[in-house]
Interface confidence: medium
């Protein structure tokens, strides 16, 4: 079986998928579902997954969830929260994705793949 995907490849794949679901998109993503905001720091892949995994029935983000599963080293299930969540702030999925995308591009440019 193939070995693990290099972090740089997984990050590019995640960026490309986030671009796919946001490009020229004005309709509310996932019917305007709200998710917990996260701190965009170390461990953000797991935190992002913990937030997005609570959105159900939204096919637009299935692939994003799958890529994040590959980037997060531990098992994540719905209802699970880490200290990285800003628990008093909920934002729309579309804004969450846009914030995450901008941060990931910054990481990629700086060569921070892990």
């Amino acid at each position: 079986s193939p070995g693990p995907v290099p972090p740089s490849t997984a990050l590019r794949e995640l960026i490309e998928e986030l671009v796919n679901i946001t490009q020229n998109q004005k309709a509310p993503l996932c019917n305007g579902s709200m998710v917990w905001s996260i701190n965009l720091t170390a461990g953000m892949y797991c935190a992002a997954l913990e937030s997005l995994i609570n959105v159900s029935g939204c096919s637009a983000i299935y692939r994003t969830q799958r890529i994040l599963h590959g980037l997060c080293p531990h098992k994540v299930s719905a209802g699970q929260f880490s200290s990285l969540h800003v628990r008093d702030t909920k934002i729309e999925v579309a804004q969450f994705v846009k914030d995450l995308l901008l941060h990931l591009k910054k990481l990629f440019r700086e060569g921070q793949f892990n």
Epitope: N24, A27, R109
Partner: antibody, heavy 126, light 108 residues
């Protein structure tokens, strides 16, 4: 000043090939999504295709009438966009414009094609 | 393939309001963009993301969108606004661009 300058147009026979270039200046080319748009004489605008920035996957999409015949590429080190046109047909005769599809790509924004070149004329005729 | 539909021509007198429509099935979820093209010149973006006006575009240009219809409105049209106007958007995937057939605006 943001600027796009196309070159490489000219007269070519049906079945022939041509490569157009678009030199960009005044903005961070590597961040930008770039498009080609054409306009046949006396007709409307027609989207030809688009290439994303490398950081956004470098994905290339083509309009159905040119898919398989035209190839879009970019050289970020030279700030240049290319359109390789093969198996040309008389109906490919048009002014070809390059345009920035996303100068704000760095910020995850999409502004539409907000800067255009002056265009280069491609004539396909026997 | 996906299409955007515009009226071929619109005529108004100077000072009147011109409205140009653009219809497409994906417009409820995808933004519309409007371009002005004067004879022999490259297109110029006048409205982006349905309603936003780039810097340098006069305030008389505005855009709106409802359902499958986007509208470009020129309030108090002037003789210099006479041009071809094209709407642009993408198909539902966002991957393929498409222009409307264009509308010739006559201000006489």
């Amino acid at each position: 000043e943001v600027q796009l300058v196309e070159s490489g147009g000219g007269l070519v026979k049906p079945g022939g090939s041509l490569r157009l270039s678009c030199a960009a200046s005044g903005f961070t080319f590597s961040n930008a999504w770039m498009s080609w748009v054409r306009q046949a004489p006396g007709k409307g605008l027609e989207w030809v295709g688009r290439i994303r920035s490398k950081i956004d996957g470098g994905t290339i999409n083509y309009a159905a009438p040119v898919k398989g015949r035209f190839t879009i590429s970019r050289d970020d080190s030279k700030n240049t966009l290319y359109l390789q046109m093969n198996s040309l047909k008389t109906e490919d005769t048009a002014v070809y414009y390059c345009a920035t599809d996303q100068v704000g790509a760095y910020y995850g924004d999409y502004y539409g094609m907000d800067v255009w070149g002056q265009g280069t004329l491609v004539t396909v005729s026997s | 393939s996906y299409e955007l539909t515009q009226p071929p021509s619109v005529s108004v007198s100077p000072g009147q309001t011109a409205r140009i429509t653009c219809s497409g099935d994906a417009l409820p979820e995808k933004y519309a963009y409007w371009y002005q093209q004067k004879s022999g010149q490259a297109p110029v973006l006048v409205i982006y993301e349905d309603t936003k006006r780039p810097s340098g575009i006069p305030e008389r240009f505005s855009g709106s969108s409802s359902g499958t219809m986007a509208t470009l409105t020129i309030s108090g049209a002037q003789v210099e606004d006479e041009a071809d106007y094209y709407c642009y958007s993408t198909d539902s995937s966002g991957n393929h661009g498409v222009f409307g057939g264009g509308t010739k605006l006559t201000v006489l």
